[in-house]
């Protein structure tokens, strides 16, 4: 009985379509393989970048996979052929593995790469981005920015920078149509005559990092003689309410601060009859069910009453 | 429909360079291999090099290793020979062919002539 | 490198008939053979892989078998659109090498 045995995959390698991070996987099947003409073959693939403890793996009947990388780091990968056991009348056979690793020679040294890099969605609408030159480098070093996200043919360059003494210190991006629940890829290089700038590479979903308006039209209303409902209105643009969780700062009197965080735009506050004034202030996030994480935004104005008027009816301000 | 175009073909003389082009369309050029064979006066088909469809692999006879290149731009389905140090025993019609996925060549072009002599 | 040898250069056919082109390997290349057909004044084109596979749009007249060192292309009910030269090639590893050709004529 001769043992079954078949080869790995051929020419597998790694290949950078331009996308700034997002890399195709591909193979060739591997030879002898209509031999299992009858059987469909597998391949288990495992990559991941390196320094990173764990591996992605895989398992698919396709020639290719597609997915994100740090390219800050090098990738490695690796893969065989699998044959399932229906094939073999026994157990799994396993080709040898085949490797392949891919990185991008750096230019320049570390320090040159841009510093703080910061982005922040503004209201789920508008993508800024900001930076800090290189340690040491001159004024003649000017850095430019490029992205991509699936649905863009190709990578883009920011068209609108923002400037300091001549230098690109940061992006305000166009309209991002369909951006969102994807990775967002970008590349900042730059360019010196005094010596090489090293790019530097990120990765985020543009969900997670929405900063909203504040809310606005805040309101109280005499619930009854002990309790007063605060109101206020979603931050107009286009995060809906159901994406909203809510800071609030209440201070009576000047002493007692209550701080809450609610997922409506209600608070009900129990208080007494000798309050003389109460106040608050709100902020808005975007919540766990609209993204993993986001920023608060800015403080609402401030919304007082003071006076006798506490204990009567509705409270407008 | 694979349509596979091959260009740059000519006289040179010997110890000359000459680049070949292939244009490719039909088919999604980054997931497959491509070949140059050449087919001689005698008629004898010889392959000359392989790239594979990222462009990571290239493979050669010993024949032409060191005198010649073969390159792809997957951005513009094109597939390229650099051939230099061209000597008489290259003069023959050279064919660009996509390896299909058993690494035999499924598909070929029309041929471009190249000529080598003083 | 592998030496793939066609020993008949030529052969004769009619129209109707079977007619099988033989190939041989110098060493064992598996099953990774494959067959090309060049019509006069006209580029090769793919007939037959992993030594018994045909192309699609291939006609069933056309038959590969063998494996390791000897192959055959088989021509049945032979057309007169059959005349060509048939080549067959090894991929089982680099170099690649072609046989040297068998022209067939058909009476």
């Known amino acids: 009985d001769t043992e079954i045995k078949v080869n790995p995959p051929q020419d597998f390698e790694i290949v950078d379509p331009g996308y700034l991070g997002y890399l195709y996987l591909q193979w060739q099947p591997p030879l002898s393989l209509d031999h299992f003409k009858e059987c469909t073959v597998e391949y288990e693939l495992k990559y991941r970048n390196i320094g990173s403890e764990t591996w992605k793996t895989i398992i698919t009947k396709n020639l290719h996979y597609k997915d994100g990388f740090d390219l800050n780091k090098g990738i490695e990968a690796k893969i065989h052929t699998l044959l399932p056991w229906q094939c073999t009348n026994g157990s799994e056979v396993q080709s040898s593995w085949a490797e392949t690793t891919y990185w991008i020679s750096p230019q320049g040294i570390p320090e040159t790469k841009v510093q703080d890099m910061d982005c922040v969605y503004y209201n789920w609408q508008y993508l800024l981005c900001s930076w800090k030159p290189g340690i040491g480098v001159l004024l003649d070093t000017n850095y430019n920015l490029f992205y991509w996200y699936e649905g863009l043919d190709h990578a883009l360059q920011c068209v609108d920078y923002i400037k300091a003494d001549g230098q690109n210190i940061g992006c305000r991006f166009p309209y991002l149509e369909a951006s969102d629940y994807k990775d967002f890829y970008i590349c900042v290089n730059g360019s010196s005559e005094n010596k090489p700038i090293r790019s530097s590479y990120f990765t985020f979903q543009l969900q997670n990092i929405v900063k909203p308006l504040p809310p606005v039209y805040l309101t109280f209303t005499r619930e009854s003689s002990c309790e007063i409902k605060l109101k206020w209105s979603i931050p107009l643009g286009p995060i809906p309410a159901r994406c909203f969780d809510y800071e609030i700062e209440i201070r009576e009197d000047d002493t007692t601060l209550v701080t809450a965080t609610v997922e409506n735009e209600t608070y009900t506050l129990k208080t007494t009859n000798e309050t003389r004034q109460l106040c608050f202030v709100v902020r808005s996030k975007v919540n766990i069910y609209c993204s993993d994480d986001g920023i608060w935004s800015e403080w609402s104005d401030k919304q007082c009453w003071e006076g006798e008027d506490l204990s009567k009816k509705t409270l407008l301000r | 429909e694979v349509k596979l175009v091959e260009s740059g073909g000519g006289l040179v003389k010997p110890g000359g360079s000459l680049k070949l082009s292939c244009a490719a369309s039909?088919?999604?050029?980054?997931?497959?291999?491509m070949s140059w064979v050449r087919q001689t006066p005698e008629k004898r088909l010889e392959w000359v090099a392989t790239i594979s469809g990222g462009g990571s692999y290239t493979y050669y006879p010993d024949s032409v290793k060191g005198r010649f290149t073969i390159s792809r731009d997957n951005a513009k389905n094109n597939l390229y020979l650099q051939m230099s140090s061209l000597r008489s025993e290259d003069t023959a019609l050279y064919y660009c062919a996509r390896r299909d996925l058993r690494s035999a060549m499924d598909h070929w072009g029309q041929g471009t002539s190249v000529t080598v002599s003083s | 490198d592998i030496v793939m040898t066609q020993s008949q250069k030529f052969m004769s056919t009619s129209v109707g008939d079977r007619v099988s082109v033989t190939c041989r390997a110098s060493?064992?290349?598996?099953?990774?053979v494959a067959w090309y057909q060049q019509k006069p004044g006209q580029s090769p084109k793919s007939l037959i892989y992993s030594a018994s596979y045909r192309y699609s749009g291939v006609p069933d007249r056309f038959t590969g078998s063998g494996s390791g060192t000897d192959f055959t292309l088989t021509i049945s009910n032979v057309q007169s659109e059959d005349l060509a030269e048939y080549f067959c090639q090894q991929y089982n590893s680099y170099p690649l090498t072609f046989g040297g050709g068998t022209k067939l004529e058909i009476r």
């Open positions: 060493q064992n290349v598996d099953i990774n």
């Open positions: 039909g088919f999604t050029f980054s997931s497959y291999g």
